[in-house]
């Protein structure tokens, strides 16, 4: 038969950061290839990554159409060298993925401090707004555009000479903090979606940036 000795995929896993979304699975193929299908709960199946020997498939283009929808994917296994034939009625083995809702489940990528500027005893710290592949009216949206006020940034800041980390929060991408005059400070930011309750609620911390280095400006 057309699917003799093919093994169904297993361990289907969604890997998604800032909506860049890849489905991964096992096993590495031996004499077989895979095709992926994706659909929303109420939609039709759409085929992607036709007859691939890879064990991953980039589904970003599909999920960004509506990041608040819940998606399901499935991976079909075919013999190597398989060619679609109109006469074949036998369904190849396949495995379903877990459901995936991008808005709730995509991981938050590591943020970046774009700049900081000191004026007297105030410092304005700006977080870079990451672009995503989510589109509205043919325009790519930033992370802030997509999440709006659901996305919080926590700023950790500390005197270069001390270890205690003060915090500030914003639901924009800007912080305005008070600092002691004549002291150098270091900064790190973390993205948080407080409404989430699982591991994807926080990003990893941004790289640390310190005053006296190139990203900063100081004005009296």
């Amino acid at each position: 038969s057309g699917t003799t000795n093919t093994v169904a995929a297993y361990n289907l896993t969604w890997k998604s950061t800032n909506f860049k979304t890849i489905l991964e699975w096992e096993p590495k193929p031996i004499n077989q290839v895979y095709t992926v299908q994706i659909s929303t709960k109420s939609g039709d199946w759409k085929s992607k990554c036709f007859y691939t020997a890879d064990t991953e498939c980039d589904l970003t283009d599909e999920i960004v159409k509506d990041v608040k929808q819940t998606y399901l994917a499935r991976v079909f296994s075919y013999p190597a060298g398989h060619v679609e034939s109109t006469g074949s009625t036998e369904e190849p083995p396949y495995e379903n993925s877990p459901e995936f809702t991008p808005y709730l489940e995509t991981n938050l990528g590591q943020p970046t401090i774009q700049s900081f500027e000191q004026v007297g005893t105030k410092v304005n710290v700006t977080v870079q707004d990451e672009w995503t592949l989510v589109r509205r009216n043919d325009t790519f949206l930033s992370l802030r555009d997509v999440f709006g006020k659901d996305l919080i940034y926590t700023l950790y800041y500390w005197k270069s000479s001390s270890s205690g980390k003060k915090t500030a929060k914003t639901n924009t991408n800007e912080f305005l903090i008070d600092v002691d005059k004549g002291e150098n400070y270091c900064f790190s930011v973390q993205a948080v979606i407080p409404s989430r309750r699982t591991a994807n609620r926080k990003s990893t911390d941004s790289p640390v940036e310190c005053m006296g280095h190139e990203k900063g400006e100081s004005r009296e």
Epitope: Q190, A199, D205
Partner: antibody
Framework: EVQLVESGGGLVQPGGLLRLSCAAS????????IHWVRQAPGKGLEWVGY????????YYADSVKGRFTISADTSKNTAYLQMNSLRAEDTAVYYC?????????????WGQGTLVTVSS | DIQMTQSPSSLSASVGDRVTITCRAS??????VAWYQQKPGKAPKLLIY???FLYSGVPSRFSGSRSGTDFTLTISSLQPEDFATYYC?????????FGQGTKVEIK
Amino acid sequence: EVQLVESGGGLVQPGGLLRLSCAASGFTIAYYVIHWVRQAPGKGLEWVGYIDPSNGYTYYADSVKGRFTISADTSKNTAYLQMNSLRAEDTAVYYCARDDQSLSSPFDYWGQGTLVTVSS
Amino acid sequence: DIQMTQSPSSLSASVGDRVTITCRASQDVNTAVAWYQQKPGKAPKLLIYSASFLYSGVPSRFSGSRSGTDFTLTISSLQPEDFATYYCQQHYTTPPTFGQGTKVEIK
């Protein structure tokens, strides 16, 4: 169900040390921030310090800086308050509380508290 | 550090009364203010967050408001279970600071 349970309180002499534990269940501490707050007998609430278990960052009230250390073991889902060089004025009920890290960061869940008495 | 000045320190009221407690921040704290209720021998419980948002499960007779750096907790109709001590707290900056507390007693 979210729960925080403190333990480790007791009677200790001035200059002594004590380690308090805050065991969390119903949530993962690495995804939140944990604070310690104390309340001396008949007095108000005083913030002691915090830890973000995801990165180990901490900050302390001036009254305990250099004497108290907050740590966390994410594998045990537990935060700790190590108290050294204890003074009579450290006598209080010690609470741990969860910070939801929203914009206003309220402490949405608190433990039941553990009493620390510093006396000779 | 930001000071939170709470008043009154205590008040006597009857069941059914409207009760107002205020907190003044020593500098701008935006809306990063919470209110807690504490009963003797118990841990504090969150009532209001972000100055005016009612925490889940808290009766609607509790409300919070903000005017600049002044924050108000109102109990529209005091119930027997509301006799307790109330604290405001700012968490706009580190360290977070509490008001001194207001003890609501039975008249």
